[in-house]
């Protein structure tokens, strides 16, 4: 049994993939920050968890995904007061009993140190200094991310 | 209706400690970061500390680093600051209010708590 | 930390006339820019919210405006009710900072 969250976690990743494919992002649109090879966009307002993941889709992007914890310094440098929090594409699935991320893979133990519990209705959100366990009710802002195409030298046969 | 009811306050002599507590209704409290915010007689508002819904994340005005500590018990809908060496100049009404972290404003405020601190 | 200034520090005005009081941020503080109201033994009130979002049940007279560094709030035709102090605050960084406070008196 999928709790609501996980359901619409699903169904936009769904519709995602359902649409027809897009030709690569080269550069980042206006207002969104290069990090690396992403596209960050950093939202201003608040919204519970659910919301902040359909507002990524509408801009045809996704919740925050980490990689890694050098990725995580790398966006907690982008975040300007140690009293804002972000929610990013990362819950607590009941279902296997495991923080999921939004793209259906399990959260490596060793990536993020995250404050507080491991339960239902829990998100995450990222800080300044840290990564924490929080209510997916709570409104608070959010994270979305767009992934920059690598530009590749095209090499042609000899004439 | 949301409610918030302060109590704990009153008279202890400077050096001494004092735990406010603020009795939380009328919304799931689980999900608001809650704040501490201050008010000496006859003086304007000083926001003292905040907490995020969770209790994971706590920050504070250089005023109450190092001797206060904000904290929060979800099951109680209850959140607390205890006060430590506390000072002449801690002495105020001390309010619990909705919100805290960025850019939340203040929009549910209790009725207030009087601490004073005197010899 | 950011220093929030009111002015007028203290106001007299008569019911049914038009009240402005400003705040100034030192540095600028974008639309995150709140509005209270406290009546003497009172908690505080929430008026506005992201410099001119007027909170739920509160009074149309009363509105805000500006971004950067500069707000006001406007009460458009005072009330009996309305003589209080104002206090304006910012939730763009920490510390949470508030203005001095604007006292509305009766003339």
């Known amino acids: 049994q999928k709790s609501s969250i996980e359901k619409c976690s699903v169904d936009i990743q769904q519709s995602r993939n359902k649409t027809t494919e897009r030709p690569g992002l080269l550069n980042c649109p206006i207002y969104w920050q290069q990090l690396r090879e992403k596209c960050l966009l950093f939202s201003h307002t608040v919204n519970p968890w659910n919301n902040s993941l359909a507002d990524c889709s509408t801009k045809e992007s996704s919740l925050l995904l980490i990689r890694d914890k050098d990725e995580l310094i790398h966006t907690q440098n982008l975040i300007r007061d140690k009293a804002i929090l972000f929610w990013i594409g990362l819950n607590f699935s009941l279902s296997e009993k495991n923080w999921k991320w939004i793209n259906g893979s399990f959260l490596n133990s060793n990536d993020l140190e995250i404050r507080g519990d491991a339960k239902e209705n829990s998100c995450i959100s990222i800080s300044q200094t840290s990564v924490y366990s929080e209510y997916c009710s709570t409104e608070i802002r959010w994270i979305c991310q767009k992934e920059l195409t690598p530009v590749r030298n095209k090499v042609y046969p000899d004439s | 209706e949301v409610q918030l009811v302060e109590s704990g306050g009153g008279l202890v002599q400077p050096g001494g400690s004092l735990r406010l507590s603020c009795a939380a209704s009328?919304?799931?409290?689980?999900?608001?970061?809650m704040s501490w915010v201050r008010q000496a007689p006859g003086k304007g508002l000083e926001w003292v500390s905040a907490i995020s819904g969770s209790g994971g994340s706590t920050y504070y005005a250089d005023s109450a680093k190092g001797r206060f500590t904000i904290s929060r018990d979800n099951s109680k809908n209850t959140l607390y600051l205890q006060m430590n060496s506390l000072r002449a100049e801690d002495t105020a009404v001390y309010y619990c209010?909705?919100?805290?972290?960025?850019?939340?404003?203040?929009?549910?405020w209790g009725q207030g708590t009087l601490v004073t601190v005197s010899s | 930390d950011i220093q929030m200034t009111q002015s007028p520090s203290s106001l007299s005005a008569s019911v049914g006339d038009r009240v402005t009081i400003t705040c100034r941020a030192s540095?600028?503080?974008?639309?995150?820019l709140n509005w209270y109201q406290q009546e003497p033994g009172k908690a505080p009130k929430l008026l506005i919210y992201?410099?001119?979002s007027l909170q739920s049940g509160v009074p149309s007279r009363f509105s805000g405006s500006g971004s950067g560094t500069d707000f006001t709030l406007t009460i458009s035709s005072l009330q009996p009710e309305d003589f209080a102090t104002y206090y304006c605050?910012?939730?763009?960084?920490?510390?949470?900072?508030f203005g001095q406070g604007t006292k509305v008196e009766i003339k």
């Open positions: 992201a410099a001119s």
């Open positions: 540095q600028s503080i974008s639309s995150y």
């Open positions: 605050q910012q939730t763009y960084s920490t510390p949470l900072t």
């Open positions: 209010a909705r919100g805290g972290y960025l850019p939340d404003a203040f929009d549910y």
């Open positions: 009328g919304f799931t409290f689980s999900s608001y970061a």
